[in-house]
Interface confidence: low
């Protein structure tokens, strides 16, 4: 049985192959229940997370996990050597930077070790599940009387990057967002010296060097000009 | 012949156009003059007429496809030329190689639209016209606003370093009259230079409430 | 200023062989990484390979991954792209680029080597 999973990270080409043994008719063997779906998650390009729903399991158990490359030179089947664990129960498995290779097929397959015909594989591709660090270092420069710029910086190759930009004053109810490219820099080519305004970044792996859909966590907030907390009643509603 | 200093510039809208300029001081008026464009890697050629658009410089436009076909790409080099006619025999001006994604001028911002006034502030919005794929999101846009009393000379630019197609402009005076326009530049190209302003979209702020302190 | 300059392109039959090189100029070449990136006839640009300023770290897109091999000489300001196996779909306009700015901005891009894949 080959079934496509469509996981929130756009992995649409990701598919799980579940190994049956026979079984009576009366009953499902333990060997028919499904495994749990397994998130890999490369962030930074530093480490990988892999984890599963290990509390999806009718009774405690340690899953264990493989991951190998297909059709690479790094095709040897791996064991996990670093597990996550959540309640003492294996949760997950954490992947040094020396072993992710992002442009080349991960496979990974989770096993019942107490059931070893109990597994599913996966096959991902990681250059669409990197999630970079947030932005750091938000600085405005005054560009003229009314004009600001936003710079930041990523820990991550910039030519990979995309970001989104949201600023909000004092006075609004909502963020206003911009899309911006790899050059981490954004023009607010108009501003209100009497509002208070507040700017964050997040940042995604693409479209260049992946097609990633998940974006980097917030940068901390940067702020620019005065509060008029006076006359406007949405100030408060900033830091909710 | 023709004598004196002799200025041969073109641009390409990153599209199906090329437009030149040619000035000669001291050409004679009633020439007739062409430039012809011989690309390097296409099977096509153009030519357009030169006209003139002042005492010593003449213009035309090479209409290279559809508005919005891809013509050319970075890597074409097309050879430009200035030919007029002596008698029954053509004679070469000026010559140029050109490498059309080195030298861009994109078509000015179309479709300006006031989106939301309030008595301070304006958002406005606008489309880039004919600009190709290749650019992704590479352009940056200058603005600029014309209060009452000013020139468009004396109106501060305004810059945006991201492709944003539109600007909230904020501080408005109430229930006053201005202008708009906008212009882009791709971020590719040395010799590459801003678009023509828009066409300038006027619009009104609204009134101050009544017995309010504005 | 900074200057990349390819060469190698060429017309090459389906299953051949091409090098692409990159001589880089106007920068310390050791301390960046570098990429290659492609644009075939009317299409985007597409990224191809990676790599880090050490040139231990190689990064390549899947459509490449076991024909092309990338490397650079950081003594000889060099950047090379080893491309077997091609196909008619590797036809394109190939870009080394300087890793800090891939991208068709121009500000540190080469003017490309065509290279065309054809029987």
């Known amino acids: 049985l080959n079934t496509t999973i469509l996981t929130p990270n756009g992995n649409e080409d990701a598919t799980t192959d579940f190994f049956l043994t026979s079984m009576p008719t009366d009953s499902l063997s333990v060997s028919t229940l499904p495994l749990p779906e397994v998130q890999c998650f490369v962030f930074n390009v530093e480490y990988m997370n892999c984890t599963w729903n290990s509390s999806s399991e009718p009774q405690p158990t340690n899953l264990t996990l493989h991951y190998w490359y297909k059709n690479s030179d790094n095709d040897k089947v791996q064991k996990c050597s670093h597990y996550l664990f959540s309640e003492e129960i294996t949760s997950g498995c954490q992947l040094q930077k020396k072993e992710i290779h992002l442009y080349q097929t991960f496979v990974v397959q989770l096993q019942d070790p107490r059931e070893p015909r109990r597994q599913a594989t996966q096959m991902l591709k990681l250059q669409n599940l990197v999630i970079p660090w947030a932005p750091e270092n938000l600085t405005l420069r005054k560009l003229s009387e009314s004009q600001l710029e936003l710079n930041w910086n990523n820990r991550f190759l910039n030519h990979c990057l995309e970001h989104l930009v949201q600023y909000r004053t004092d006075w609004d109810h909502s963020w206003t967002e911009q899309s911006v490219d790899y050059r981490h820099k954004f023009s607010l080519p108009s501003v209100d010296g009497q509002k208070r305004y507040t700017f964050r970044v997040r940042s995604r792996f693409n479209p260049l060097c992946g097609s990633a859909q998940h974006w980097s966590e917030w940068s901390h907030p940067i702020h620019w000009g005065s509060n008029s907390s006076k006359e406007n009643p949405f100030l408060f509603a900033l830091e909710a | 012949a023709v004598n004196g200093t002799s200025r041969f510039t073109c641009f390409y809208n990153s599209r199906a156009n090329i437009s030149c300029v040619w000035s000669q001081d001291g050409a004679l008026q009633d020439t007739s003059c062409q430039v012809h464009a011989w690309p390097d890697r296409r099977r096509w050629n153009q030519t357009c007429e030169l006209l003139p658009v002042s005492q010593a410089s003449w213009a035309c436009n090479l209409i290279l496809g559809t508005p919005d076909s891809q013509k050319l790409t970075a890597v074409d080099i097309v050879t430009l030329r200035v030919m007029c006619r002596e008698g029954v025999r053509w004679r070469m001006m000026a010559i140029q190689d050109f490498k059309p994604f080195e030298n861009l001028r994109l078509m000015a911002p179309i479709s300006l639209q006031v989106v939301h006034v309030e008595t301070h502030r304006c958002n406005i919005s606008w489309k880039i016209s004919q600009a190709s794929h290749y650019f992704e999101r590479h352009l940056e846009f200058e603005a600029r606003t014309l209060s009452p009393g000013h020139t468009w000379e004396e109106a501060p630019l305004m810059t945006l370093k991201q492709k944003q197609e539109w600007i909230c402009l904020e501080t408005l005076t109430p229930d006053t009259q201005y202008e708009f326009q906008v212009r882009v530049k791709p971020l590719q190209g040395e010799f590459t230079t801003w678009s023509p302003w828009s066409q300038p979209l006027a619009f009104r702020t609204k009134p101050a409430a009544l017995g309010k302190d504005t | 200023q900074v200057q990349l300059v390819e060469s190698g392109g060429g017309l090459v039959k389906p299953g051949g062989s091409l090098r692409l090189s990159c001589a880089a100029s106007?920068?310390?070449?050791?301390?960046?990484?570098m990429s290659w990136i492609r644009q075939a006839p009317g299409k985007g640009l597409e990224w191809v390979s990676s790599?880090?300023?050490?040139?231990?770290?190689?990064y390549y897109a899947d459509s490449v991954q076991g024909r092309f091999t990338l490397s650079r000489d950081n003594a000889e300001n060099s950047l090379f792209l080893q491309m077997n196996s091609l196909r008619a779909e590797d036809t394109a306009v190939y870009y080394c680029?300087?890793?800090?700015?891939?991208?068709?901005?121009?500000?540190?891009r080469g003017q490309g080597t065509l290279v065309t894949v054809s029987s």
């Open positions: 680029a300087r890793g800090d700015a891939v991208s068709i901005t121009g500000d540190y």
């Open positions: 790599i880090s300023s050490s040139g231990d770290t190689i």
């Open positions: 106007g920068f310390t070449f050791s301390d960046y990484y």
